[in-house]
Amino acid sequence: AILGRSETQECLFFNANWEKDRTNQTGVEPCYGDKDKRRHCFATWKNISGSIEIVKQGCWLDDINCYDRTDCVEKKDSPEVYFCCCEGNMCNEKFSYFPEMEVTQPTSNPVTPKPP
């Protein structure tokens, strides 16, 4: 393990659509992936008239958007489905929404992340 980084080996699992997807509804998911690649946890949810409905929680493959995030926080402004990812065992047990101020989209595609 690399010092200062929390490795993700398992995440909270939840699937609201478990019957259709033929999975368990809830539990703990061991995270698998290519050797040397990082692993993360994620949570997705909807906000239906102020009521939070969890859609899915589980393991997420190596993603630079999730690096060094110990907390699962959605920063996009009013997405249709909220998504957050994080590093560390079961880090997706809690999740939150803190939208960043949106900057006007540049005329060409940014390769770097959109600035806050």
Epitope: D63, P79, T112
Partner: antibody, heavy 115, light 111 residues
Framework: QVQLVQSGAEVKKPGASVKVSCKAS????????INWVRQAPGQGLEWMGT????????SYAQKFQGRVTMTRDTSISTAYMELSRLRSDDTAVYYC????????WGQGTLVTVSS | QSALTQPASVSGSPGQSITISCTGT?????????VNWYQQHPGKAPKLMIY???KQQSGVSNRFSGSKSGNTASLTISGLQAEDEADYYC???????????FGGGTKLTVL
């Protein structure tokens, strides 16, 4: 093992639409992104866009904005890329690839646009 | 975002080492360790060789290595073999807040 299997070759007329599918197996489909890339005959790779397989959130290259739609059906672990208002210069092999690193690729789908 | 810049072609003899460059800007290649390298044989799908500038994809020969200096990423192939003859592309991570872009590709000829 991880596999992405794409739908078969298509021949379309200018102005029509095409929908290419990409069926994933060997990993949890909802654990990453699916990216779409195309390659015109004798040309390089061109990124079209990406879809978050669990949330359905998409990002499209500006060039394709308004003409491309990426969707997925998590119950059958399949991603879709639909390109509308086809032109002859859309003739290309279209690839899907797993994750932001493009670590596994589909075999490609040849789309020919010809009148 | 304009494509990353690669040489159109490079060549080398069996056993030699070759390096392919991929030049971007201070806001993409220069700022982040997220450049990848792909190998593509004619009529085949691309294959990830190096990701995150210098990490080897599982199952890839250790003759392939990646590095970065300033705004330029490089792929080095040592002990060149006939089967290394292919097109090589650099590209960036794409997903979430990141948009993808590829280099124009480099044709490697093994003499």
């Amino acid at each position: 093992q991880v596999q992405l299997v794409q739908s078969g070759a298509e021949v379309k007329k200018p102005g029509a639409s095409v929908k290419v599918s990409c069926k994933a197996s060997g990993y949890t489909f909802t654990s990453s992104y699916i990216n779409w890339v195309r390659q015109a005959p004798g040309q390089g790779l061109e990124w079209m866009g990406t879809i978050n397989a669990v949330s359905g959130s998409t990002s499209y290259a500006q060039k394709f904005q308004g003409r491309v739609t990426m969707t997925r059906d998590t119950s059958i672990s399949t991603a879709y890329m639909e390109l509308s208002r086809l032109r002859s210069d859309d003739t290309a092999v279209y690839y899907c690839a797993r994750s932001g690193w493009f670590d596994y690729w589909g075999q490609g789908t040849l789309v020919t646009v010809s009148s | 975002q304009s494509a990353l810049t690669q040489p159109a072609s490079v060549s080398g003899s069996p056993g030699q080492s070759i390096t392919i460059s991929c030049t971007g800007t201070s806001s993409d290649v220069g700022s982040y360790n997220y450049v990848n390298w792909y190998q593509q044989h004619p009529g085949k799908a691309p294959k990830l060789m190096i990701y995150g500038v210098s990490k080897q994809q599982s199952g890839v020969s250790n003759r392939f290595s990646g590095s970065k200096s300033g705004n330029t990423a490089s792929l080095t192939i040592s002990g060149l073999q006939a089967e290394d003859e292919a097109d090589y592309y650099c590209g960036t991570f794409a997903g979430g807040s990141y948009y993808g872009v590829f280099g124009g590709g480099t044709k490697l000829t093994v003499l």
